[in-house]
């Protein structure tokens, strides 16, 4: 099985024990590590952070001791903006320039492939996204002709039904991608006005969301029905939680909220907590399991957080094995307890290690 793990370059800027550099990563933990994100500048792939080149080097030296490790560079992301991607993909010359710029950039920095993180193609971009993937793959095939190992091509896709329908021609893009990471998280957010888990495995009777689509099981099944081969589908598991501020004394699933949860001490983003911040939060909190959804949430005061723990990730891995998927994807290594100092287990990357162990279990 694949264990595809994202690392985010901006995690270096978190304060104190939250600061994560690629040399803190475990070279034997994941089969693939994806560095997020690269930029596109004037139609050419490029660095984003001032010290990306140094960080690329840190990441890719992990392969010196584990030659089986593959590294990819993810291009795009939330801050890149869908419109910018759209302009490049829809213009033949821009698309060509971008595609031609990718292999030398990846080879220069020692990456084994490219991950496309266009979040998200619009309805009018669907065909252009397919073309971009098809042409990028063709370039990788030609570029490998002189006996080089062919560069890998993957994409991170939304797990939301509405986005899947409008953005992706799943059957066509699956032909050209080496694997597809389905982002089976962020199903539920503060916009709903109530508490709810952002990454439930199943719908469950407790699901207060107005549809039956906002869960991992539906998203995976839908992708498979649309023609994604199970052998290419990698299922996303978050090492972060989504938090809410309760608006009343109600604390269950579907309780009213006044907005996102308070920012974490390190991640500093309202409504989001890294797993290592959740471990802190759990001291003195009340933990509940949403039985049907097979995921936990915790409450403390007026704060509510839905997250994944070692038990829930094992359930998710069992599920992906039952469906014969290619493996698991983790967002993100730097949100796990990468130092092993927060979650009291004396173990670095406890969630990702639990995923790895479950994937290896017979």
């Amino acid at each position: 099985y694949k264990l595809v793990c994202y690392y985010t370059s901006w995690s270096q800027y978190r304060e104190g024990d939250g600061s994560c550099f690629p040399d803190a990563l475990d070279r034997f933990l994941c089969t693939h590590i994806i560095y997020s994100f690269a930029n596109i500048s004037n139609d050419h792939i490029d660095t984003w952070e001032w010290n990306d080149v140094t960080l690329y080097g840190m990441l890719n030296t992990l392969k010196n001791r584990n030659p089986n490790l593959k590294t990819l560079l993810s291009v795009g992301g939330w801050n890149f903006g869908s419109q910018r991607f759209s302009k490049i993909a829809s213009n033949t010359q821009s698309r060509r320039t971008f595609i031609k710029s990718v292999p030398p950039f990846l080879r220069t920095h020692g990456f084994d492939g490219l991950d496309l993180a266009w979040l998200y193609p619009g309805r009018r971009d669907k065909q252009h996204f397919t073309t971009l993937i098809k042409e990028m793959k063709a370039e990788f095939i030609k570029e490998a002709q002189p006996g080089k190992k062919q560069l890998l091509l993957s994409a991170a896709l939304s797990a939301g039904k509405v986005t899947i329908d409008s953005s992706y021609d799943i059957a066509k893009i699956s032909q050209h991608l080496d694997f597809i990471s389905i982002m089976t998280y962020d199903f539920h957010g503060a916009w709903r006005g109530t508490t709810g888990h952002h990454s439930p495995l199943f719908r469950g009777q407790e699901d207060a969301s107005p549809d039956r689509f906002s869960n991992t099981d539906y998203a995976v099944g839908y992708m498979l029905r649309l023609g994604a081969p199970a052998s290419k589908l990698v299922m996303g598991i978050p090492t972060f939680g989504r938090s809410f501020t309760l608006a009343s004394s109600e604390t269950g699933v579907g309780a009213p909220i006044s907005g996102p949860g308070i920012p974490g001490r390190f991640t500093k983003e309202a409504g989001t907590l890294a797993y290592y911040e959740i471990c802190d939060f759990l001291r003195g909190a009340t933990v509940h399991r949403i039985l049907g959804q097979q995921v936990p949430y915790a409450t403390k005061g007026n704060q509510w957080v839905g997250y994944d723990d070692q038990e829930s990730v094992k359930s998710k891995v069992q599920y992906l094995k039952d469906r014969q998927l290619a493996g698991a994807m983790v967002w993100a290594l730097d949100l796990d307890d990468f130092q092993g100092s927060f979650c009291g287990q004396d173990l670095r990357f406890p969630l990702t290690n639990a995923i790895k162990d479950a994937l290896a279990a017979t």
Partner: antibody, heavy 118, light 110 residues
Framework: QSVEESGGGLVKPEGSLTLTCTAS?????????MCWVRQAPGKGLEWIGC???????TYYASWVNGRFTISKASSTTVTLQMTSLTAADTATYFC????????????WGPGTLVTVSS | ALVMTQTPASVSAAVAGTVTIKCQAS??????LAWYQQKPGQPPKLLIY???ILASGVSSRLKGSRSGTEYTLTISDLECADAATYYC????????????FGGGTEVVVK
């Protein structure tokens, strides 16, 4: 691994000239760039243009204005056709090879001198 | 068209000293910048590509860096062999930008 220019010499104003760049010792690579750069006596380097070996795409500096044409003559040779030459085109013309713009030109020929004079 | 403005035109420094050469791009070119060294009667030699990566066989006394659209080449612990003209070059080969060179900086080592 080397590149070498040939075809330089004296040419009259408004005349034409074709320079040839020959690459040798390189293992096969799908995509690389063969480019032309010139340097007037005592002056700096000036980029003329490039051809992408992979698909034959050509790129030119805006000042070229169609007077110069870069083309692939064979798997190892590239030509620079120059027309409507003036005294301002007098320079040493270098051929340079690089795997991409990102990686710069890592192989240069010794240069060939073109003199435009009546 | 893209213009690469290189400063200073000439710089003089003593052996074991340090020189800094700057190159200002008129538009953003990201990390697509290379530095070359040229000695009289010779073709240019690639020193640095991708803003900061040393080409094969180039001394670690050379360092490339960037701040926005300003690029810097620093040569420390100067040697007599460093006396040459240095050029920056944009690494975009498309016709919108062209692989424009800076005007060059002559380094004199005393």
């Amino acid at each position: 691994q080397s590149v070498e220019e040939s075809g330089g010499g004296l040419v009259k104003p408004e005349g034409s000239l074709t320079l040839t760049c020959t690459a040798s010792g390189f293992s096969f690579s799908y995509r690389y760039y063969m480019c032309w750069v010139r340097q007037a006596p005592g002056k700096g380097l000036e980029w003329i243009g490039c051809i992408d070996n992979g698909d034959g795409d050509t790129y030119y500096a805006s000042w070229v204005n169609g007077r110069f044409t870069i083309s692939k003559a064979s798997s190892t040779t590239v030509t620079l056709q120059m027309t409507s030459l003036t005294a301002a085109d007098t320079a040493t013309y270098f051929c340079a090879r690089g795997s991409s713009g990102y990686n710069g030109f890592n192989f240069w020929g010794p240069g060939t001198l073109v003199t435009v004079s009546s | 068209a893209l213009v690469m403005t290189q400063t200073p035109a000439s710089v003089s420094a003593a052996v074991a000293g340090t020189v800094t050469i700057k190159c200002q791009a008129s538009q953003s070119i990201g990390s697509y910048l290379a530095w070359y060294q040229q000695k009289p009667g010779q073709p240019p030699k690639l020193l640095i590509y991708a803003t900061s990566i040393l080409a094969s066989g180039v001394s670690s006394r050379l360092k490339g860096s960037r701040s926005g659209t300003e690029y810097t080449l620093t040569i420390s612990d100067l040697e007599c062999a460093d006396a040459a003209t240095y050029y920056c070059q944009c690494g975009y080969y498309d016709s919108n930008y062209g692989g424009a060179f800076g005007g060059g900086t002559e380094v004199v080592v005393k």
